[in-house]
């Protein structure tokens, strides 16, 4: 289970993403925003500094909308 405000690396990071995102799946990096112009990665944001549930959830894939 996810423990808030801690660093996550290795398989523990992958398992936590799988737990948080479930069937949606997840990405290891997000596309660069027009503001930052550089891509951010889950490792940079969660492995070398603490990250919370809200941040983890931003790496979840968005499920396809059903018609």
């Amino acid at each position: 289970a996810y423990r808030p405000s801690e660093t996550l690396c290795g398989g523990e990071l992958v398992d936590t993403l799988q737990f948080v995102c479930g069937d949606r799946g997840f990405y290891f990096s997000r596309p660069a925003s027009r503001v930052s112009r550089r891509s951010r990665g889950i490792v940079e944001e969660c492995c070398f500094r603490s990250c919370d549930l809200a941040l983890l959830e931003t790496y979840c894939a968005t499920p396809a909308k059903s018609e």
């Epitope: 690396c9 290795g10 398989g11 523990e12 990071l13 992958v14 398992d15 290891f28 490792v43 940079e44 492995c47 070398f48």
Partner: antibody, heavy 120, light 107 residues
Amino acid sequence: EVQLLESGGGLVQPGGSLRLSCAASGFTFSKYEMDWVRQAPGKGLEWVSVISSSGGGTIYADSVKGRFTISRDNSKNTLYLQMNSLRAEDTAMYYCARGRTLYGGAFDIWGQGTMVTVSS
Amino acid sequence: DIQMTQSPSSLSASVGDRVTITCRASQPINTYLNWYQQRPGKAPRILIYTSSTLQSGVPSRFSGSGSGTDFTLTISSVQPEDFATYYCQQSYSFPLTFGGGTKVEIK
């Protein structure tokens, strides 16, 4: 051919410093995190440190924290390990290794190693 | 830190024997367990990753299994080049840790 080649080892006195290098070839170095692993004579393997692909993040074993610094120069395809305040227990063969360890992966490529001996 | 315990520390086998090495983690690591072979005077090389996936180029006589805390490396029919030391390693969390090694010797 994918290859890692370490250099910089040698004999150093306790308290001294040494800088190890690891030259990478045959793969896109900047896309991989890199690690250092060491092996004392006649002993098992001990993980030392990892650096992210960009060089922006590092993690160290407690046994070397505050004394060793891992870094990389992606423009030169080279990994480094700056070793300060060396102790007798740092005597070991030092290997650089490639692997997606930050994502739970294994060390898939190893260098041949460079020997560091700390002795007076 | 996660402690990795390998057993036995050494074993003797004859060519053609089936060899089994076990590795136990001090806490669950899912399948984030890797196996390496190290011949005398050489660098380690990867054999198996994520518990059971055979690295490309590694002979099929090597196999791995396990999940959670208990893992096994099996050599179905030991060949002369397999006499070496084998290490398990967890990649679940940092610091990364290795087992103490198992030396496979010729009987």
